[in-house]
Interface confidence: low
């Protein structure tokens, strides 16, 4: 007589909300002479999900039809998943006794899990823009995932970064998880054309991961370089004051022209020219009349970018000593 | 018998917590789900969530979300129900009720109920 | 969410009467596995609620046979084949298919 195993092939189900979940048992004999049913958990506290024949379990279907008299598969199907119905079902067969059956033998256990895909990771910058070479922190949040486990990685322009801190909340049992990860991320100057990626990878996505993705653009901010130029014009008496603002972001630029401390002229950045590296660069010009000058003029340019503390550069307008002459003349 | 013994009235402030707790006697603890409904001053019954206490799995019904928890202690048989950021709304008869998820999932058995009154 | 409503919401009789009230949800609660995912209970007066049907026909175990549950799909009857004084209370239904809803409520009173 061969010696009865309860089969239960599937160590762990994977089920979504709302499916059907098939359990499945098979025996390889018909002996002993009694029923099989089917509990969730063990011990003295366990639940009774199924019994052929008695109780009313109207969310619980046989398979195969167990009243043929020589069937061996008592796989069961749920329907209708919802999250409380997670954890072990393990199928239970019973030796007929009097006046009770008498439990012979448990099959290994199938532990149902919920299966729920993880929400697309959404990936944040930090509050406020920062300057090369400084550390800015991206976080990446995806929720709603079962079960826990669950791969994040980050990435900058592709290649994959390893300064980051993840948590997958609750650590205990849920019914689904949430993850936050927090990279951490030296901006270059070079970086308005950068982008960070987080990317989750999860059993219920079948190998083809969610992204979520930043631009470092929303991150960076580059202060510009500033070069000032004098240029005397054909006609003598007057001289083009050529004020360039160069590799700037993001494109939120004010200049002041002041003359002696008094401004002259308010501009506001518009045709800008674009670098390759998303940086601008921006040109602007002042012409002074140098014939009604009778003394040295103090020429400032003050360039406010993006907020920040203006930067001011001056330069002099020396007036030749023969103008200075007949401007003195011309005051008499 | 089965028995569903919930502890008694209380009386909070708006913006507090307060936990109920339901113990169970009678049956194997771990064989019933632990439903929450339940009923404001002469209005209906309103169902809150459930706690399986065997796997200790809560499922919320969507308007409590965030605001309910749910926990269960095997030890002790009960089960607990906390309501936060409670509201003059609030103030209701919380029933604790016992379901057989695949038997037929009636609650067949309820606790005597606890009367929280939110009033500043 | 599944939208229980009851008819009527007030319901005089006289013991010995029969009394019927109706349910209708805004949904079907027939499951493909053929059960009407539907309950009803009844709170007496300073009391809990308890079980009197579930899925749609099936008295719950110690409630008198004079109560019987019928009804598919949409619409449901509760029937109290001959009303008795400790019968009054109010009656609802619930629908248990999704998350869990109950109709507003029907107040048996005894004439």
């Known amino acids: 007589e061969e010696e009865l195993q309860m089969i239960q092939p599937e160590k762990l189900l994977l089920v979504a909300v709302g499916e059907s979940a098939t359990l499945n048992c098979t025996v390889t004999s018909l002996l002993p002479v009694g029923p099989v049913l089917w509990f969730r958990g063990v011990g003295p506290g366990r639940e009774l999900i199924y019994n052929q024949k008695e109780g009313h379990f109207p969310r619980v279907t046989t398979v195969s039809d167990l009243t043929k008299r020589n069937n061996m598969d008592f796989s069961i199907r749920i329907s209708s998943i919802t999250p409380a119905d997670a954890g072990t079902y393990y199928c239970v067969k019973f030796r007929k006794g009097s006046p009770e059956n008498v439990e012979f033998k448990s099959g290994p256990g199938t532990e149902m899990a919920l299966r729920a895909k993880p929400s697309a990771p959404v990936v944040s910058g930090p509050a406020a823009r920062a300057t090369p070479e400084h550390t800015v922190s991206f976080t990446c949040k995806s929720h709603g995932f079962s079960p826990r486990d669950i791969t994040l990685k980050w990435f900058k322009n592709g290649n994959e970064l390893s300064d980051f801190q993840t948590n997958v909340d609750p650590a205990g049992q849920s019914v689904s998880y949430s993850i936050r990860s927090t990279a951490r991320v030296v901006l270059a100057p070079w970086d308005v054309r950068s982008q960070v990626t987080c990317e989750v990878a999860h059993v219920t996505l079948q190998g083809d991961p969610l992204r979520g993705t930043a631009n470092l653009s929303e991150a960076i901010r580059v202060p510009p370089t500033l070069e000032v130029t004098q240029q005397p014009m054909r006609a003598g008496n007057q001289v083009n004051i050529t004020y360039q603002v160069r590799n700037f972001y993001p494109q939120n630029l004010q200049l002041t022209w002041l003359e002696n401390g008094n401004v002259c002229r308010t501009e506001t950045a518009s045709t800008l020219t674009e670098n390759k590296d998303g940086t601008y660069n921006w040109t602007s010009w002042l012409l002074v009349n140098t014939s009604d000058q009778r003394d040295d003029v103090v020429l400032t340019c003050q360039v406010k970018h993006d907020g920040q503390l203006a930067v001011n550069k001056s330069l002099v307008l020396e007036v030749s000593a023969h103008q200075k002459d007949q401007s003195s003349d011309a005051t008499h | 018998q089965v028995q569903l013994v919930q502890s008694g009235a209380e009386v909070k402030k708006p913006g507090a917590s307060v936990k109920v707790s339901c113990k169970a006697s009678?049956?194997?603890?771990?064989?019933?789900?632990i439903n929450w409904v339940r009923q404001a001053p002469g209005q209906g019954l309103e169902w809150m969530g459930i706690?399986?206490?065997?796997?200790?799995?809560?499922y919320y019904a969507q308007k409590f979300q965030g605001r309910v928890t749910m926990t269960r202690d095997t030890s002790t048989s009960t089960v607990y129900m906390e309501l936060s950021s409670l509201r003059s709304e609030d103030t209701a008869v919380y029933y604790c009720?016992?379901?057989?998820?695949?038997?037929?999932?009636?609650?067949?058995?309820w606790g005597q109920g606890t009367l929280v009154t939110v009033s500043s | 969410d599944i939208v229980m409503t009851q008819s009527p919401l007030s319901l005089p009789v006289t013991p010995g009467e029969p009394a019927s009230i109706s349910c209708r949800s805004s949904?079907?609660?027939?499951?493909?596995?053929?059960?009407?995912?539907l309950d009803w209970y009844l709170q007496k007066p300073g009391q809990s609620p308890q079980l009197l049907i579930y899925?749609?026909?099936s008295r719950a175990s110690g409630v008198p046979d004079r109560f019987s549950g019928s009804g598919s799909g949409t619409d449901f009857t509760l029937k109290i084949s001959r009303v008795e004084a400790e019968d009054v209370g109010v009656y609802y239904c619930?629908?248990?298919?999704?998350?869990?809803?109950f109709g507003q409520g029907t107040r048996l009173e005894i004439k």
């Open positions: 009720a016992s379901s057989r998820r695949y038997w037929n999932g009636a609650f067949d058995y």
């Open positions: 009678g049956y194997t603890f771990t064989s019933h789900d």
């Open positions: 706690s399986n206490p065997s796997g200790g799995s809560t």
């Open positions: 949904q079907s609660l027939l499951h493909s596995n053929g059960y009407n995912y």
């Open positions: 899925l749609g026909s």
């Open positions: 619930m629908q248990a298919l999704q998350t869990p809803t």
